[in-house]
């Protein structure tokens, strides 16, 4: 009995989650990835913000940079150069879009500890970066590139055409960085900083979103962005490269497209430099089924750049598109020209192929029915990768060694057995000759970060293992999560259940299904989180799941192009068939089940609502998009072609929320949107109240003025606390 | 002592058939790529085709492709040549030879035997 | 790929140094490698991707190049370095041999 009567009484000191814990960010945790600058050395922002350069194997640390400098500029970033020779300070962070922002630079001269007087950079700058050898400093500022040789020199301006909304040299504009590029820039420096390449992209003939933007001021300001929703005209994109060493010699050069793709709509999809005169570009047909890559040579005759047919590589998909979410880029090998990719094998499984000569010739490395995810390093004797394949769970990450040194290649799990029970979701970062790494573990236990020594794998030390959050959640009662599978026609539904703490099989619980269910996503992993959702079970006693459909990633080619040239089909239908299947399992009231989704997700969990099938009482849609014609080009054509008579436009007709309406009549739908959102505009949510009211269907909405997709700052705490009185009022839950 | 040594050469008639084979001792046989190469008398070197260490990938000279066959059994170290429908000049001395793996994915052909002479005359 | 050896034959001095020559009809990525065959024996290897010497190969050989051009190069020749020269690609099959180099004493 006294075993009981203690668990019994330290049950009583435990206390639910709030929704306050979760708007505060009570229980976030921290990572650790080491800044690495060579291959046993890391610089790392220190608790008390000085920059504090590590030597792994002397074991000493000093400041590089004082929290004084940081804070006489209020710096919140830095960078430091190659050379160790200076530092940029970045102030006055601005965010633009994603990933995009401009800042100011200030530069910090080591040597004398003094700021560099005389040639200042401009402001605000929208990129800026340093060679990867020395101190050069390229930068675009007002859509344009500038190069100095050293800080202190007056810049150099490789191009003059940048204009505004128009001309983008060096940077993305919207449709590049959002679905394409994924970052805030668009230019590469060669591995010794002798060349720059960049893109540059023409968004002049794009049509205009334009949004209000209220602000404080009488007249609200008009936000206006090329932006191609499926079928517009795309932006025309060039790449080119200067030597910068002479940049005035010659000038940007050009560097050709391949004919095959050049013959119609194209785009630029990554550039990877191997060598200093070598460098390889992906390029992909507007039609995202066919992908080729380019390996081009600097030719120091002409000064041009050669890229011989001999050196493309295509990369076809019969069954989707090409790639997963992105076409994956190459991992060069040693001889410069040889290199690892991942791919679709013959079975329709992403692995490791090994390109020598022509795709076709590829040797497989990695095979099975899991997926190689990504490719972190290879050196001369190993390739570490990350897969699912510990398990067979497809929402684990674990790291993997192949020595390719020798043969035959053999393969390690290096994370498999660390921290089985709490680890099983990793990433690495990895130093220069993958001589040391970090591993930061995400879940499902508290992540922890440690530091590897990249020969034996040996562990050397914890970087960050989140002890104040785990003495934190002693005292909290936390959900049980399970991640099961079900077996349905075929279809392999992967999903992850959410329970409250004193989950009684006898007992009836209201059901709330998290949607995303975008191609390539995944919701089901084996991941740490304290968030909303983990407070509805907690304290509201509900039962939340996710679940993996088909159109999701990582369990092959079948489920992943399942949905391709249909979207809102498949994924709808199989969230409704996990939906019945849990009711099934007996602990379901199903007369309270609701469903919620954010932008891909808030599109699915509207046309769940709108089935029919009287499965849901409620639903939430966040930021839908509510018809694929009002949606990005680079992302909507990807999975569902054109929305042309000859193509696909049928479906793009028949998969909107709009031609549902009428089936929202019979369910409790809460619609939101951001009134500034510029990557789901707002006119998706206008459109489906349009509809709704033209129907003469009750709803209920709330707008957010001036806020963009994500929904930050004050907003996050007023959309949570409306959405969570939304489903207690659903559920019939007292507030 | 890395050791390749062919055998089952001689004297066929245009037409005929002939298996050569090449027993390895010395070294571990199934993890290295093996080669034939044959050279006419008095001419240079001809490469046949290659087979990697599990049969899995087995390449040919095209205009051999048709006739010839190559495989190989680990658990006997031995690695064969098929021979089909052969003509006058597919008369030489025919070597295997044995490779290093190397990174990255290929071999070299660092052991070679003393080869066995094919000559086809009717 | 066809492969371009020169010369077809040379003849040489002891002590010596020669250079023999291997074109490659297209980019082999200095995927080569050099033989040495004596009369009535088999062939053996001497360099490796381009510019490596095999195990036991005397320093006074040495392999050059890129792209399509590659050569051998003999320092101080020996009375054992007298016979055949070949030079093969491994860039992508079929693996064919250049012509070979008939290096005779004068």
């Known amino acids: 009995l006294r075993p009981s009567r203690v668990h019994n009484s330290e049950e009583n000191t435990m206390r639910a989650l709030t929704l306050k814990d979760i708007l505060n960010g009570t229980f976030s945790y921290k990572t650790f990835f080491p800044n690495w600058i060579s291959g046993q050395e890391y610089l790392h922002q220190s608790a008390d913000n000085n920059i504090v350069l590590y030597n792994i194997e002397t074991g000493q640390s000093y400041t590089i940079l004082s929290n004084r400098t940081m804070k006489s500029v209020n710096a919140s970033n830095y960078g430091l150069s190659p050379d160790r020779q200076f530092v940029y300070l970045e102030s006055d962070y601005s965010k633009l879009w994603r990933y995009s922002y401009t800042a100011t630079y200030y530069i910090y001269d080591l040597s004398n500890g003094e700021f560099v007087r005389g040639n200042e950079l401009p402001r605000p700058i929208q990129y800026l970066c340093w060679s990867p050898v020395g101190s050069k400093l390229a930068y675009v500022y007002q859509n344009n590139i500038y190069l100095k040789q050293r800080p202190g020199d007056p810049p150099f301006q490789i191009t003059f055409n940048g204009r505004e909304n128009k001309i983008f040299n060096g940077i993305p504009d919207w449709v590049y960085e959002e679905e394409m590029l994924a970052t805030k820039y668009a230019l590469w420096w060669s591995p010794n900083g002798k060349f720059l390449a960049y893109a540059e992209f023409n968004d002049t003939d794009i049509p205009v979103i334009a949004y209000s933007y209220y602000g404080d001021e009488q007249y609200p300001r008009t936000i206006n962005i090329p932006y191609p929703k499926a079928g517009a005209k795309n932006p025309v994109v060039r790449i080119f490269i200067i030597d910068t060493t002479y940049p005035a010699y010659v000038g940007p050069q050009e560097v050709p497209v391949p004919a095959m793709i050049a013959s119609s709509d194209y785009y630029f999809s990554w550039l990877t430099w191997v060598t200093d005169e070598r460098v390889c570009l992906q390029w992909l047909k507007r039609v995202q089924n066919v992908s080729v890559l380019s390996i081009c040579d600097f030719r120091e005759d002409w000064q041009t750049w050669d890229c011989p047919k001999t050196q493309e590589h295509i990369e076809e998909s019969r069954t989707g598109w090409a790639g997963g979410f992105f076409v994956s880029t190459p991992v060069f090998s040693y001889d410069a020209i040889s290199y690892y990719k991942i791919f679709s094998d013959k079975d329709g499984y992403k692995h490791i192929h090994y390109i020598k000569d022509t795709v076709e010739n590829a040797i497989q490395i990695t095979s099975g029915k899991w997926e190689a995810i990504n490719i972190f390093r290879v050196t001369q004797d190993s390739l570490f990768y990350s897969s699912n394949e510990f398990e067979e769970y497809p929402g684990r990450r674990n790291i993997y060694r192949i020595s390719i040194g020798s043969y035959p290649p053999s393969k390690k799990c290096v994370t498999c057995h660390l921290r089985k029970e709490r680890c099983q979701y990793y990433t690495a970062s990895f130093s220069d000759y993958a001589k040391y790494y970090a591993l930061v573990c995400y879940g499902p236990g508290i992540p922890i970060s440690t530091l590897h020594d990249g020969r034996t794998d040996q562990e050397i030390k914890i970087l960050e293992e989140n002890k104040e959050l785990e003495n934190a959640l002693k005292n909290i009662q936390l959900p049980k999560e399970e991640i099961k599978k079900l077996e349905v026609d075929e279809i392999t539904l992967w999903y992850k259940m959410i329970l409250p703490p004193q989950f009684d099989r006898s007992k009836k619980y209201p059901l709330l299904i998290q949607v995303y269910g975008g191609p390539c996503s995944q919701s089901v992993r084996s991941v740490f989180a304290v968030n909303w959702i983990s407070y509805l079970a907690s304290k509201e006693g509900m039962v939340i799941a996710l679940v993996d459909g088909r159109g999701t990633a990582f369990q092959g080619d079948k489920l992943l192009y399942a949905v391709y040239r249909k979207l809102g089909v498949y994924e709808v239908e199989d969230q409704i068939t996990a939906v019945r299947k849990f009711i099934e399992m007996g602990f379901i009231d199903e007369k309270r089940i609701a469903i919620w989704g954010w932008s891909y997700g808030g599109y699915v969990s509207s046309l769940a609502l709108a089935s029919g099938t009287g499965l849901f009482k409620c639903g939430i849609a966040v930021a839908p998009v509510s018809s694929w014609e009002y949606y990005a080009s680079v992302y909507t054509e990807r999975f569902m072609g054109l929305p042309t008579k000859d193509d696909n436009l049928e479906h793009y007709k028949n998969s909107t929320v709009m031609a549902r309406a009428e089936y929202f009549r019979n369910v409790d739908y809460l619609l939101i949107h951001g009134t500034a959102d510029d990557n789901v505009h707002f006119q998706n949510s206008a459109q489906i109240a349009k509809a709704l009211v033209n129907a003469q269907v009750d709803f209920q909405a709330m707008w957010y003025s001036d806020q963009n997709h994500g929904l930050s700052g004050l907003s996050t705490n007023h959309l949570y606390t409306h959405m969570t009185h939304f489903l207690k009022q659903c559920f019939s839950l007292s507030d | 002592e890395v050791q390749l040594l062919e055998s089952g050469g001689g004297l066929v008639q245009p037409g005929g058939s002939l298996k050569l084979s090449c027993a390895a001792s010395?070294?571990?046989?199934?993890?290295?790529?093996m080669s034939w190469v044959r050279q006419a008398p008095g001419k240079g070197l001809e490469w046949i085709g290659e087979?990697?260490?599990?049969?899995?990938?087995?390449n040919y000279t095209p205009s051999l492709k048709d006739k010839f066959i190559i495989s190989r059994d680990n658990a006997k170290n031995t690695l064969y040549l098929q021979m089909n429908k052969v003509r006058s000049e597919d008369t030489a001395l025919y070597y295997c030879?044995?490779?290093?793996?190397?990174?990255?994915?290929?071999?070299?052909?660092?052991?070679w035997g003393q080869g066995t002479t094919v000559t086809v005359s009717s | 790929l066809v492969m371009t050896q020169s010369p077809a034959s040379l003849s040489a001095s002891v002590g010596e140094t020669v250079t023999i020559t291997c074109r490659a009809s297209?980019?082999?990525?200095?995927?080569l490698a050099w033989y040495q065959q004596k009369q009535g024996k088999s062939p053996q290897l001497l360099v490796y991707?381009?510019?490596t010497l095999a195990d036991g190969v005397p320093s006074r050989f040495s392999g050059s190049g890129s792209g399509t051009q590659y050569s051998l190069k003999i320092n101080s020749l020996q009375p054992e370095d007298f016979g055949s020269y070949y030079c093969?690609?491994?860039?992508?099959?079929?693996?064919?041999f250049g012509g070979g180099t008939k290096l005779e004493i004068k």
């Open positions: 030879a044995g490779g290093y793996y190397r990174y990255p994915y290929y071999y070299t052909m660092d052991y």
């Open positions: 010395g070294f571990d046989f199934s993890t290295y790529w």
């Open positions: 087979i990697n260490p599990d049969s899995s990938t087995i």
């Open positions: 297209g980019n082999i990525h200095n995927y």
């Open positions: 991707n381009a510019k």
């Open positions: 093969q690609h491994f860039w992508s099959t079929p693996y064919t």
